[in-house]
């Protein structure tokens, strides 16, 4: 995990786009892929376990001059906590992969509350990119304009 | 260092808009989401509203058809109108700053010291 | 909207004493919560947020404990500069409410 986090709490929820699409995941071929579609109103919603981590941010990253924290998440798929959505800087492609202790910088997103109903996430190890959504796939997009629908995400409470 | 500044009229008449500025220093309002509370005489806290850092906002339900609240990042300001007054509306009004970049989960740890508003005509 | 009911609405101690206050969310709000202190003519201040931490600079006779819908705010041993009113609010869900208050008076 990255130096100076510290767990603050963690809860499940479900991941859905602006567009109210579901986030889901499957097993194909013995590992999970991440699907972005259109699910029914009856059926039930896959669910991520979230787990909030508090940042410390140094004056000297800040740069406002003092000192601040940020709101971190890594995310599981409830169905197998010991995977994380993992930000893959080399391809912009959002993926799963497991870990064998704990989770490495690029599967840590800041938390950003973009409205009453909507969140983005901000990859920790790419600044100004997020989480987005991309032909009906999660990818990595780097966000010029942070009210860009594709990158806002709702967490709907279990 | 962090400092929240409210400015404004101290009375306003019954019907009127209510207008307030917080002057912020020490931070950025592209990183924090700024708040506005307010507290009756003798009575409890009561949240009116967030400018979030982003740029969006939210209000209390009760006050949403009443209250705007805007900011001028250019001079570090973020504004609140309260439309059509009442007696009720008398209080002192704080802003206050989010304790986390970009969310409002970690409550809010710099408050400015508060300005009373009468109204009354 | 959620409302959050704190109890007591105030309570009487004593220098020394453990003074123990609750708040209780309508709708579950995970750990989503801070309790802040406010003494007469001054503004709010910060002690506990996500439910358990400690806002810097406040002393350790300070705790928070709970989630979901039920929280707790302890002050272990109760010092002169305690006395106080004190409020929970909820930071899960826009409209950020408040609730109504505990004033610990001096018994």
């Known amino acids: 995990s990255i130096q100076g986090t510290s767990l603050l709490t963690q809860s499940p929820a479900s991941l859905s786009t602006y567009n109210d699409q579901s986030v889901s995941f499957v097993l194909e071929n013995g590992c999970y892929v991440i699907n972005v579609d259109d699910s029914g109103k009856d059926q039930e919603q896959d669910q991520v376990l979230l787990r909030y981590y508090e940042s410390p941010c140094p004056a000297s990253q800040s740069g406002d001059g003092v000192d601040g924290k940020k709101l971190m998440v890594n995310m599981s798929p409830i169905k197998d906590t010991d995977i994380w959505l993992h930000a893959n800087d080399k391809d912009y492609s959002v993926e799963l992969q497991r870990g064998d202790v704990s989770p490495p910088e690029q599967a840590f997103f800041v938390l950003h509350k973009k409205s009453s109903d909507f969140v983005s996430f901000e990859c920790k190890n790419l600044p100004g990119t997020y989480i987005g959504v991309k032909d009906n796939q999660l990818a990595l997009v780097e966000e010029k304009d942070e009210s860009c629908n594709n990158i806002m995400f709702k967490l709907s409470k279990i | 260092q962090v400092q929240l500044q409210e400015s404004g009229p101290g009375l306003v008449k019954p019907s009127e808009t209510l207008s307030l500025t917080c002057t912020v220093s020490?931070?950025?309002?592209?990183?924090?989401?700024v708040h506005w509370i307010r507290q009756p005489p003798g009575k409890g806290l009561e949240w009116i509203g967030v400018?979030?850092?982003?740029?969006?906002?939210g209000y209390n339900s009760a006050l949403m058809s009443r209250v705007t609240i805007s900011k001028d990042t250019s001079k570090s300001q973020v504004s609140l109108k309260l439309s059509s007054v009442t007696a009720a509306d008398t209080a002192v009004y704080y802003c206050?700053?989010?304790?986390?970049?970009?969310?409002?989960?970690?409550?809010?740890?710099?408050w400015g010291q508060g300005t009373l508003v009468t109204v009354s005509s | 909207d959620i409302q959050m009911t704190q109890s007591p609405s105030s309570v009487s101690a004593s220098v020394g004493d453990r003074v123990t206050i609750t708040c209780l969310a309508s709708?579950?709000?995970?750990?989503?919560l801070a309790w802040y202190q406010q003494k007469p003519g001054k503004s709010p201040k910060l002690l506990i947020y996500?439910?358990?931490r400690l806002a810097d600079g406040v002393p350790s006779r300070f705790s928070g404990s709970g989630s979901g819908t039920d929280f707790t705010l302890t002050i272990s041993s109760l010092q002169p500069e305690d006395f106080a009113t004190y409020y929970c609010?909820?930071?899960?869900?826009?409209?950020?409410?408040f609730g109504q208050g505990t004033k610990v008076e001096i018994k």
């Open positions: 400018l979030r850092a982003g740029g969006s906002t």
């Open positions: 020490g931070f950025s309002l592209s990183k924090y989401g």
């Open positions: 206050a700053r989010d304790h986390y970049y970009y969310s409002s989960y970690g409550g809010f740890v710099y």
């Open positions: 609010q909820q930071l899960d869900s826009s409209p950020y409410t």
């Open positions: 709708q579950t709000i995970g750990a989503w």
């Open positions: 996500a439910a358990t």
